[in-house]
């Protein structure tokens, strides 16, 4: 499918001051936008609150690797 | 926007070994899963080996187990791949892959892909 011609850009401004635990995480997607000021980290939690995170942060890092273990398709 | 510039590839004999390096720029190494991915003249790019953002969780295809290493230098923005015990049937380009999104070792969900170098294992 064509990309959509001016698509809104979803930006982090600010990022989560706070560790979250990976219990209440439920997804991430990065944004990579050169539209953005910051590279990010968006946090879906399991309740469906979005939340801006720094990858720079280990704990953020940490969390994704956590997260992408989880859609590891198990070997049989 | 991540850049990666693979090297070490050549033409090595059956039983021997090479490194791969992938060298990153142009992002925040460590918060990107990283692989590496072979193909050969019409099949579909395959998944060799990852690893995790930490260095602390490692993927391997089965068919290199125990003969191919992935590492990472967080440090330096690299990427390694040991390759020992080299076969004839390794023989391929091998495409170095960096994921931002969600996800494992399927190709699709890698965002950011070096050029490829070759590597021949003539028997």
């Known amino acids: 499918q064509p990309d959509a011609i001016n698509a809104p850009v979803t930006c982090c401004y600010n990022f989560t001051n706070r560790k979250i635990s990976v219990q209440r995480l439920a997804s991430y997607r990065r944004i990579t936008s050169s539209k953005c000021p910051k590279e990010a980290v968006i946090f879906k939690t399991i309740v469906a609150k979005e939340i801006c995170a720094d990858p720079k942060q280990k704990w953020v890092q940490d969390s994704m690797d956590h997260l992408d273990k989880q859609t590891q398709t198990p070997k049989t | 926007e991540v850049q990666l510039v693979e090297s070490g590839g050549g033409l090595v004999q059956a039983g021997g070994s090479l490194r791969l390096s992938c060298a990153a720029s142009?992002?925040?190494?460590?918060?990107?899963?990283m692989a590496w991915f072979r193909q050969t003249p019409g099949k579909e790019r395959e998944f060799v080996t990852l690893?995790?953002?930490?260095?602390?969780?490692?993927d391997y295809t089965d068919s290199v187990k125990g003969r191919f290493t992935i590492s990472r230098d967080n440090a330096k923005n690299t990427v390694y791949l040991q390759m020992n015990s080299l076969k004839p049937e390794d023989t391929a380009v091998y495409y170095c892959?960096?994921?931002?999104?969600?996800?494992?070792?399927?190709?699709?969900?890698?965002?950011?892909w070096g050029q490829g170098t070759q590597v021949t294992v003539s028997s």
């Open positions: 142009g992002g925040t190494f460590s918060s990107y899963r």
């Open positions: 892959a960096a994921a931002g999104s969600m996800g494992w070792n399927h190709f699709r969900e890698y965002d950011y």
């Open positions: 690893i995790s953002r930490s260095g602390g969780t490692t």
